[in-house]
């Protein structure tokens, strides 16, 4: 069946260039009219970038001409999109899409890769505990969690009592700071009667930092 | 360019209903428009191009119609695996915009948020830095304001939130905002409060805790 | 954990009647029009009726109305879908749903 299989997404500082691959299995690939798109954090799609079966014709959105360049190597069945002059809002997920036939619509998808324009350097996080108090009880809830702050890139990932706590969890998508450095929170509600026998631990994985942190969570000791 | 806009932005639905999104373009197309679904995390799948022909494997519950500047995309019994955003895209010219999107949700009722507020803690004042987050748990519907006051007087331009993704299993949203100060800044007030606006409230609710008190 | 229970499916024969039952959790149950679809041998997943949060508003798929009956006991968090005067036709597994989630389904078999 028809795959194609992105590759070269990654971390790169403003200005610099990235090159992306899509590679196509499952069809004749020099038949076929691909296109780039891309996503923005939270936001819609946008058209990209198209080159025709032949090579003969090469079309780019306004936002990216004269920076991007999109070629094909037909004998390795894979399409490429050169990135020059890189910009922070160039931060997206690129997918390839290949058209149906002869009609320009996106009948296949790649699975997409990040591209993530910044001039911050790989940095884990900070775990701090948000502990429950009076201020965080309602009815006979309590609500406790963790600041996961200044880290890059992103993704990391938030369990609670290694896994073994799922209900009641919140972790929410990071936010990027003005310092370019994300920060999340993850929080749990839990009974309030268990804040004095049951620990709390959120267990925070940052992969490109090589970070792990184990942080318990027990109410604030006056 | 020919522009596309979609309507709604954003859609609630329950299961079974019948619900329609518009898409509209700035010139005629004729019927050079492909409708897409798409999944938090994933690729956009094709459900419909030519305006009203539907991709193989689509559900026929999908229906595509118009021509020129105006179509519609409608699910005629919307079913759990519907719940997605949807994009229009027109292939009439070089440029293949699409529209800016129709988030489909699922459609609750009014749930008011819980309220909790976290001061810092001593470890991350040692850092030199204090964040004050406000939680706001479970409420739907997803519309909700937080103002931060610190010692009464309104903040703005030092705050950030994030909410999540509808809730699976409740349909319900939750929210955090976090105030970032320098510790110095921190250090100069005694009252951090956090006043909550929702539908689900009758009146504004306000968390809010004393510097340096337990 | 499971947030949509179905059960109540069986083998009947045509002109009979069976009561499927969908227990839910209470959050769901509370807030959320819930439905029934059913998918028979080879066809779509296909709408069959569905109940508003309070109990106010009932569809129904037009060849089943006057045969099946939708309803919720808001003491046990249970929608029932009653079917009355049961075809071959009818022949399908039923599943229920409310929000993102779906029941496991319950077949139903009508012999003629």
């Known amino acids: 069946q028809v795959q194609l299989v992105q590759s070269g997404g990654g971390v790169v500082q403003p200005g610099r260039s990235l090159r992306l691959s899509c590679a196509a299995s499952g069809f004749t690939f020099s038949r076929y009219t691909i296109h780039w798109v891309r996503q923005a954090p939270g936001k819609g799609l946008e058209w990209v970038a198209v080159m025709s079966y032949n090579g003969n014709n090469k079309h780019y959105a306004d936002s990216v001409n004269g920076r991007f360049t999109i070629s094909r190597n037909d004998s390795k069945n894979t399409l490429y999109l050169n990135m020059n002059s890189l910009r922070p809002e160039d931060t997206a997920v690129y997918y390839c899409a290949r058209i149906r036939d002869t009609a320009m619509f996106f009948a296949h998808w790649g699975q997409g890769t990040l591209v993530t324009v910044s001039s911050a350097s790989t940095k884990g996080p900070s775990v701090f505990p948000l502990a429950p108090s009076s201020k965080s009880t309602s009815g006979g809830t309590a609500a406790l969690g963790c600041l996961v702050k200044d880290y890059f890139p992103e993704p990391v990932t938030v369990s609670w009592n290694s896994g073994a706590l799922t209900s009641g969890v919140h972790t929410f998508p990071a936010v990027l700071q003005s310092s370019g450095l994300y920060s999340l929170s993850s929080v749990v509600t839990v009974p309030s009667s268990s804040l004095g026998t049951q620990t709390y631990i959120c267990n925070v994985n940052h992969k490109p930092s090589n970070t792990k942190v184990d942080k318990k969570v027990e109410p604030k000791s006056c | 360019d020919i522009q596309m806009t979609q309507s709604p932005s954003t859609l609630s639905a329950s299961v079974g209903d019948r619900v329609t999104i518009t898409c509209r373009a700035s010139q005629s197309i004729n019927t050079w428009l492909a409708w897409y679904q798409q999944k938090p995390g994933k690729a956009p799948k094709l459900l419909m191009y030519k305006a009203s022909s539907l991709e193989s494997g689509v559900p026929s519950r999908f229906i595509g119609s118009g021509s020129g500047t105006e179509f519609t995309l409608t699910i005629s019994s919307l079913q759990p695996d519907d719940f997605a955003t949807y994009y229009c895209q027109q292939y009439n010219s070089d440029s293949k915009m699409f529209g800016q999107g129709t988030k489909v949700e699922v459609k609750g009722t009014v749930a008011a948020p819980s309220v909790f507020i976290f001061p810092p803690s001593d470890e991350q004042l040692k850092s030199g830095t204090a964040s004050v987050v406000c939680l706001l748990n479970n409420f739907y519907p997803r519309e909700a304001k937080v103002q931060w006051k610190v010692d009464n007087a309104l903040q703005s331009g030092n705050s950030q939130e994030s909410v999540t993704e509808q809730d699976s299993k409740d349909s319900t949203y939750s929210l955090s905002s976090t105030l970032t100060l320098s510790k110095a800044d921190y250090e100069k007030h005694k009252v951090y409060a956090c006043e909550v606006t929702h539908q689900g409230l009758s009146s504004p609710v306000t968390k809010s805790f004393n510097r340096g008190e337990c | 954990q499971v947030q949509l229970q179905d059960s109540g499916g069986g083998l009947v024969q045509a002109g009979g009647s069976l009561r499927l039952s969908c227990a839910a959790s209470?959050?769901?149950?509370?807030?959320?029009?819930m439905a029934w679809f059913r998918q028979a041998p080879g066809q779509e997943r296909e709408f069959v009726s569905s109940i508003s949060w309070n109990g106010a508003v009932t569809n129904y798929l037009d060849s089943v109305k006057g045969r099946f009956t939708i309803s919720k006991d808001n003491a046990k968090n249970t929608v029932y879908l009653q079917m009355n005067s049961l075809k071959p036709e009818d022949t399908a597994v039923y599943y229920c749903?409310?929000?993102?989630?779906w029941g496991q389904g319950t077949q139903v078999t009508v012999s003629s």
């Open positions: 749903a409310a929000g993102r989630n």
């Open positions: 209470g959050r769901i149950f509370s807030t959320h029009t």
